[in-house]
C-alpha cells in the first residue's frame, strides 16, 4: 500500500508536471503566436484511455513529437528551451509510471492538435492530483 | 543539394480537373512544411496554403478555401495543389515552397521554379 | 489580412547606386520581441529568391551588399551598391498572421 510520504511525492509530481504542460499550453495557445496555425498542422496520438499513471506510457510515447513543435515556438522574449522542458517531462513521467511492469498504449483512432493534446494530459494529471488530495 | 521541382506547364479547358505536384529531394521531407503561392500574370504573389507532409495537416488561406485542394505523398516526398474544375480566372503560375520556422523564424527558404497553368476554352 | 504597401512601386537606377525600398503593413508585425518581415528577389521567369529574413537577418549566400531594418509596421531593403545582377522585382513578406501577404513588389530597372 502506498505510504503518505509516497502518496505526497508522486502528488508534487503532477503538480510538476502539471505546471509544465499548462506553461507549454499558454505559451503557444496565443491568438497573436504567428505560428499557431502551423504549429496545429501537427498531429498527436491521444491515449484511448487515460485513468492511471502506467496511462503516462502513452505520453511518453509522444514526447518527442512535441519538442519537434516547441522548437518552432522560440522568441526573443520567450524562451521555452524545448530539450530541457522535454528532458524534465521525460524524468517526471519515467518516475511516475514506474518501470516495473511494461504497458502496451492503445491510441484512439482520431489524431489530435497540440493544444488538444495539451489539454488531455492536463486534465489527467489535475484528475489524478485530485483522487490523492 | 536540397530543391524542390515541380510538375511541368499545364493547358486546360474551364470545368476541367487538374493536380500539379511538388517533389522535394536533399533534406528530410516530412520535416518541413510545404506552402503554395500563386502569381497571376504580370501580378504579384499570393499566398493560398500550408501542409505538413508528415501529418497532412492543411491550413488554407480564406479565398482559397473550396477553390483548391492540397494533399501529400510522403512515401514519394510529394506535395499536390488540385483543382475540381478548373476556371479561366486560374490561369497563374503557382509554386511550392519549403517553410523556415524553428527559432524566430518564419519564412519560405527553398522554391520551386514553379508551374504554369492555363485555363482557356 | 494585414496588407503591404511597397514605395517606390518601380524606378530606375544606375550600377553603383545605393538603393532604399520601403514596405509598410497595416499593423505591427512584431512578437514578443521579433519583427516577421521578410524580403525576396524575383527576376522574370525565375522563382522568387529569399533575401532577408526576421527583418535584418542576411540568407546565406546572399551578398552582403544587401540589408534589411525596421520593426512594427515599417522595414526597410537597402542594397549599398547596386549591380547589374541586382536588376529585378523585390517584394516584401509578412508571417506574422495568416493569411501570410507580399507587398505589390518593386521593380529595379536600369536607367
Known amino acids: 500500500a502506498p505510504t503518505s510520504s509516497s502518496t505526497k511525492k508522486t502528488q508534487l509530481q503532477l503538480e510538476h508536471l502539471l505546471l509544465d504542460l499548462q506553461m507549454i499550453l499558454n505559451g503557444i495557445n496565443n491568438y497573436k503566436n504567428p505560428k499557431l496555425t502551423r504549429m496545429l498542422t501537427f498531429k498527436f496520438y491521444m491515449p484511448k484511455k487515460a485513468t492511471e499513471l502506467k496511462h503516462l506510457q502513452c505520453l511518453e510515447e509522444e514526447l518527442k513529437p512535441l519538442e519537434e513543435v516547441l522548437n518552432l515556438a522560440q522568441s526573443k522574449n520567450f524562451h521555452l528551451r524545448p530539450r530541457d522542458l522535454i528532458s524534465n517531462i521525460n524524468v517526471i513521467v519515467l518516475e511516475l509510471k514506474g518501470s516495473e511492469t511494461t504497458f502496451m498504449c492503445e491510441y484512439a483512432d482520431e489524431t489530435a492538435t497540440i493544444v488538444e493534446f495539451l489539454n488531455r494530459w492536463i486534465t489527467f494529471s489535475q484528475s489524478i492530483i485530485s483522487t490523492l488530495t | 543539394e536540397v530543391q524542390l521541382v515541380q510538375s511541368g506547364a499545364e493547358v486546360k479547358k474551364p470545368g476541367e480537373s487538374l493536380k500539379i505536384s511538388c517533389k522535394g529531394s536533399g533534406y528530410a521531407f516530412t520535416n518541413y512544411l510545404i506552402e503554395w503561392v500563386r502569381q497571376m500574370p504580370g501580378k504579384g504573389l499570393e499566398w493560398m496554403g500550408v501542409i505538413n507532409p508528415g501529418s497532412g495537416g492543411t491550413n488554407y488561406n480564406e479565398k482559397f478555401k473550396g477553390q483548391v485542394t492540397i494533399s501529400a505523398d510522403k512515401s514519394i516526398s510529394t506535395a499536390y495543389l488540385q483543382w475540381s474544375s478548373l476556371k479561366a480566372s486560374d490561369t497563374a503560375m503557382y509554386y511550392c515552397a519549403r517553410w523556415r520556422g524553428e527559432g524566430y523564424y518564419a519564412y519560405f527558404d527553398v522554391w520551386g521554379q514553379g508551374t504554369t497553368v492555363t485555363v482557356s476554352s | 489580412a494585414i496588407r503591404l504597401t511597397q514605395s517606390p512601386s518601380s524606378f530606375s537606377a544606375s550600377t553603383g547606386d545605393r538603393v532604399t525600398i520601403t514596405c509598410k503593413a497595416s499593423?505591427?508585425?512584431?512578437?514578443?520581441?521579433?519583427?516577421?518581415m521578410n524580403w525576396y528577389q524575383q527576376k522574370p521567369g525565375k522563382a522568387p529568391k529569399l533575401l532577408i529574413y526576421t527583418a535584418s537577418n542576411l540568407e546565406s549566400g546572399v551578398p552582403s551588399r544587401f540589408s534589411g531594418s525596421g520593426s512594427g509596421t515599417d522595414f526597410t531593403l537597402t542594397i549599398s551598391s547596386l549591380q547589374s545582377e541586382d536588376f529585378a522585382t523585390y517584394y516584401c513578406?509578412?508571417?506574422?498572421?495568416?493569411?501570410?501577404?507580399f507587398g505589390g513588389g518593386t521593380k529595379v530597372e536600369i536607367k
Open positions: 513578406q509578412q508571417s506574422n498572421e495568416d493569411p501570410y501577404t
Open positions: 499593423q505591427s508585425v512584431d512578437y514578443q520581441g521579433d519583427s516577421y
